[in-house]
Amino acid sequence: MAQWNQLQQLDTRYLEQLHQLYSDSFPMELRQFLAPWIESQDWAYAASKESHATLVFHNLLGEIDQQYSRFLQESNVLYQHNLRRIKQFLQSRYLEKPMEIARIVARCLWEESRLLQTAATAAQQGGQANHPTAAVVTEKQQMLEQHLQDVRKRVQDLEQKMKVVENLQDDFDFNYKTLKSQGDMQDLNGNNQSVTRQKMQQLEQMLTALDQMRRSIVSELAGLLSAMEYVQKTLTDEELADWKRRQQIACIGGPPNICLDRLENWITSLAESQLQTRQQIKKLEELQQKVSYKGDPIVQHRPMLEERIVELFRNLMKSAFVVERQPCMPMHPDRPLVIKTGVQFTTKVRLLVKFPELNYQLKIKVCIDKDSGDVAALRGSRKFNILGTNTKVMNMEESNNGSLSAEFKHLTLREQRCGNGGRANCDASLIVTEELHLITFETEVYHQGLKIDLETHSLPVVVISNICQMPNAWASILWYNMLTNNPKNVNFFTKPPIGTWDQVAEVLSWQFSSTTKRGLSIEQLTTLAEKLLGPGVNYSGCQITWAKFCKENMAGKGFSFWVWLDNIIDLVKKYILALWNEGYIMGFISKERERAILSTKPPGTFLLRFSESSKEGGVTFTWVEKDISGKTQIQSVEPYTKQQLNNMSFAEIIMGYKIMDATNILVSPLVYLYPDIPKEEAFGKYCRPESQEHPEADPGSAAPYLKTKFICVTPTTCSNTIDLPMSPRTLDSLMQFGNNGEGAEPSAGGQFESLTFDMELTSECATSPM
């Protein structure tokens, strides 16, 4: 099916992203009208070779003409009009630079395919991404259910056969002993010779039948164990491994992981079948002790069957011991696996074999870096002790679903101090936020005469001693869990693997979607790709090193990509969450694209984006205005940082923002939020009504209080303001008189504004870089 047709069938949330992909520079109608032809061209090649771009561009115009004549025959006036308009636009814009249109189309096609890929992945991971925990049963899982049912049935069938063989054996034993006691066996020469011979034949026949049945049971047991092994492999190597991978993904902001209950039911069912089978194998031993003979299959095969069932059960129990909730500080629920020394963290383990007889029987002990004592010393890692309640008994009462689990709520880490400030070795090759540690959980199970040592461990954690290390620590957690499903590679950062843009893009989007109501659009991600990788057409498959992601400073900046982005994430969550959720913040957009989309819009159209120069995270707005000569200008205000947003909400800043023109008149340059949403409609609801801004005046006082209002003003007294950020000045107060400012008519007392600036207005233009 053509890519465009596939896209039409996607969920609304994906179609929204598709809409964001298209703009005037490559209209969606054109994509629709010429879908098959557009998809058949090599745009990426055209984007890199001018001669080919020219050829493709002329062919495109030809295709438009052909489509136009089709609409002519169909008398479709609207489509004719649109197509003529599109052709004129393309000619005026790209005739001289055909490589530019090729680059735009190539990028759109790539982003489309990425969108399809994302949708397909979400579907595979359990249906609707808006119901990620929904219990969607895949075909594979149905097969698994079937296999488990088959195992249970075979166990029950064997139970019946065991009863039958026991009956036959008891009957044989009875007959044998009766004949023996009556001395019939010796009496073959006597009068009863034929009767005795007949009885002996019957006895031999019974023994043959018994042997056949025993062989059949032994063979069926071997087959059953193979079936169990297959189901167990599917459960542990696929289903449980999938759950663990999904847990990693959920830890780094991806879709929430599915609940473990179904997996627990499957594993418990298999464990029950295994114990029943073990009892059957024990029963064989009893039978053999009562009656045995030369070539007895029980003697031959039972020890191996016993060994296999014990091994299977042991391994199943070991696999079933999992970390249900990875270590996490309660104050940072969205950043698990980063632990600050001295700060409590919680974690939870669960045994997916739900045997009531194990309730309150398993004592779990927690420790850190259990197996890496020597390795840690060699590597120069820090060493830690776990403080707090580090043992807990597993029980079924604490969890609301009755699972056998133990939750540790009061654990803390303390660094073991060494002579050289805590590092076990001065030559430590890794910085502390790249040092990975494992928290291990151990217990012993005694069940039906078996002793099984259980051990599981958390995903690698990063231990910090200061909260300022959180951004880099979190980057390490992202990089690790994005690139490996190895649960315990503590040496990961000695040679960190390279990620692809597709992987990084998805994880970056999760950083927003996990704590806000929206992830990053294709357009936003493309801007981020440009920041990381430079200008390009198709970022898919492009490689990103760990250093580039979070260690090296960005070109011309004094900070890394990740530090910059993490501060923006923080800014969004703490200061502009509602606006981000509404989709009002374009956020990541290149200067070129910003200019392209705003330059065709009427004056007063503005958009909101993040500052590229502010390390601490800043947000700014850019608007369109006409200068004296009527020429379109694009202006940006100096970014607002967390410090400023602490004092005044961004919505209020936007609503109140003014510029002071040369004649000292205050004008609001922000009218429509891009593309055409009236400012009041978008931001009005996020501003406090003026009546609530201050308490009522003292009723006993002679005159009402004057109301004040903070607004931001930018003076525009210079002519060279094009594209330079404008520095906002706070207009200290705008005072209104009359009836507390509520519904006062000008005639009833008038309104006037008194302007006070909290800093001297200067005529220089702000030139801080963006």
């Epitope: 039958v164 063989v165 036959l168 009957d171 009875f174 007959n175 009885k199 039948a209």
Partner: nanobody, 126 residues
Framework: HVQLVESGGGSVQAGGSLRLSCVAS?????MGWFRQAPGKEREGVAA????????HYTDSVKGRFSISRDYVKNAVYLQMNTVKPEDAAMYYC??????????????????????WGQGTQVTVSS
């Protein structure tokens, strides 16, 4: 659950012989034969326990019919000799898991579950 499949029925002349066979899906302690003539109640004919190898017979067939078992094939056989017109009936193979199958089972007073075959018809011409 035990499945029973009979064979060997048919027409036999009075005074002649016939051999009925029945194969069970699994081993049972007790196997036997019952019959039902039109308009009459089902009656026990012969049974053989897995213990003691002694057959039990209803009085009317003693000395003429002989029951035997093959433990390997899980089969029971009824050898019918000197057949009489009153032997004509539908013959049913029966089995039960316990080994007690003497007269009490044949006269249907024994407890416990009995499994039945579909039956095989025996007709006697004079």
């Amino acid at each position: 659950h035990v499945q029973l499949v009979e064979s060997g029925g048919g027409s036999v002349q009075a005074g002649g012989s016939l051999r009925l066979s029945c194969v069970a899906s699994t081993y049972t302690g007790c196997m036997g034969w019952f019959r039902q003539a039109p308009g009459k109640e089902r009656e026990g004919v012969a049974a053989l326990s897995s213990r003691g190898f002694a057959g039990h017979y209803t009085d009317s067939v003693k000395g003429r019919f002989s029951i035997s078992r093959d433990y390997v094939k899980n089969a029971v056989y009824l050898q019918m000799n000197t057949v009489k017109p009153e032997d004509a009936a539908m013959y049913y193979c029966a089995a039960r898991e316990g080994w007690e199958c003497g007269e009490t089972w044949l006269d249907r007073t024994a407890g416990g579950h009995t499994y039945w075959g579909q039956g095989t018809q025996v007709t006697v011409s004079s």
